[in-house]
């Protein structure tokens, strides 16, 4: 059977190694069936998850999924954190598990790092 | 419409590092995750990780630390990279998109022989 | 890491029967399950995610349920081309493990 809840795909654990300059998108990976929900971001501070009200985002299709992008043009130091995107279903609220974004200031850094450097030396990104 | 191809060496020497590439066309890397797996002969399915659209990692760490995955977004292909081979690293090598629900597109495999 | 146990190992059937893999999990993974079927040097291919939603393109004779540690694959009639071997998923945490597969043979 194919369920008709609205899915949000964000992985558990998720983290993104950015540079702060660069642009860079968010993905937060949606499955519906007939009507699209009404999906949002929030960057979280502590406890509570504050609505990003202000940022771009769009919508991009494809044949099994959907992704609700949140676009950072560019990349700002201040963009380092965690973030959930949620959607609004039939009066529910679905949340999925938060994404982290570690960003590299490249003005700060000695000499601009690989994402592959990135990805398997995290230390890195808090020299 | 996604397709996967696996490419790489046969045929390895003990010891040796084992590089493998898949090339993704009819889509982009950069969306999605990049999987690699393996199945030795006779033998059932073992994730090895996978890369992000981002280029993060995750790798299966009761592999040891002997595998290093990246991604060339400007050549639309992923990498994987096994040192120090030994034969119990023969095995077929699928390269395969995670979807995020499931792992909804693989290729056809690649069959790598460690021996000397 | 979570271990998947599947069960039976290998299992003998007719053409026409129903058939019931289960796959069991070391501890609570909600419904992040995939069930694949693989034919001999072939690439495994996606029939169940979510634990019970169907793929596009996969015959409704396989249809999957369970949440939490206990899952099924049920084949409501099988077909010829249904002996091969198959294999659970989890994605719920990292490592993301298969089960030891099931093997369906003729009997």
């Known amino acids: 059977k194919e369920s008709c809840d609205v899915q949000l795909y964000i992985k558990r654990q998720s983290e993104h190694s950015i540079l702060a300059g660069d642009p860079f998108e968010l993905e937060c990976p949606v499955k519906y069936c007939a009507n699209r929900p009404h999906v949002t971001w929030c960057k979280l501070n502590g406890t509570t998850c504050v609505k990003l009200e202000d940022r771009q985002t769009s919508w991009k299709e494809e044949k099994n999924i959907s992704f609700f992008i949140l676009h950072f043009e560019p990349v700002l130091p201040n963009d380092n954190g965690s973030y959930r995107c949620s959607a609004n279903f039939q009066s529910n609220l679905i949340e999925s598990h938060s994404t982290t974004l570690y960003v590299t200031d490249v003005k700060s850094a000695s000499e601009r790092p690989s994402k592959d450097e990135m990805a398997s030396r995290p230390w890195l990104l808090y020299r | 419409q996604v397709q996967l191809q696996e490419s790489g060496p046969g045929l390895v020497k003990p010891s040796e590092t084992l590089s493998l590439t898949c090339t993704v066309s009819g889509g982009s890397i950069s969306s999605y995750y990049w999987t690699w797996i393996r199945q030795p002969p006779g033998k059932g399915l073992e994730w090895i990780g996978h890369?992000?659209?981002?280029?993060?990692?995750h790798y299966n760490p009761s592999l040891k630390s002997r595998f290093t995955i990246s991604a060339d977004t400007s050549k639309n292909r992923f990498s994987l990279k096994l040192s120090s081979v030994t034969a119990a690293d023969t095995a077929v090598y699928y390269c395969?998109?995670?979807?995020?629900?499931?792992?909804?597109?693989w290729g056809q495999g690649t069959t790598v022989t460690v021996s000397s | 890491a979570i271990q998947l146990t599947q069960s039976p190992s290998s299992l003998s059937a007719s053409v026409g029967d129903r058939v019931t893999i289960t796959c069991r999990a070391s501890?609570?993974?909600?419904?992040?399950v995939a069930w694949y079927q693989q034919n001999p040097g072939k690439a495994p291919k996606l029939l169940i995610y979510d634990a019970s939603s169907l793929e596009s393109g996969v015959s409704s004779r396989f249809s999957g349920s369970g949440s939490g540690t206990d899952f099924t694959l049920t084949i409501s009639s099988l077909q010829p081309e249904d002996f091969a071997t198959y294999y659970c998923?989890?994605?719920?945490?990292?490592?993301?493990?298969f089960g030891q597969g099931t093997k369906l043979e003729i009997k």
């Open positions: 395969a998109r995670d979807g995020y629900y499931a792992l909804d597109v």
């Open positions: 998923q989890q994605f719920n945490n990292y490592p993301y493990t």
């Open positions: 890369i992000s659209y981002s280029g993060s990692t």
């Open positions: 501890q609570d993974i909600s419904n992040t």
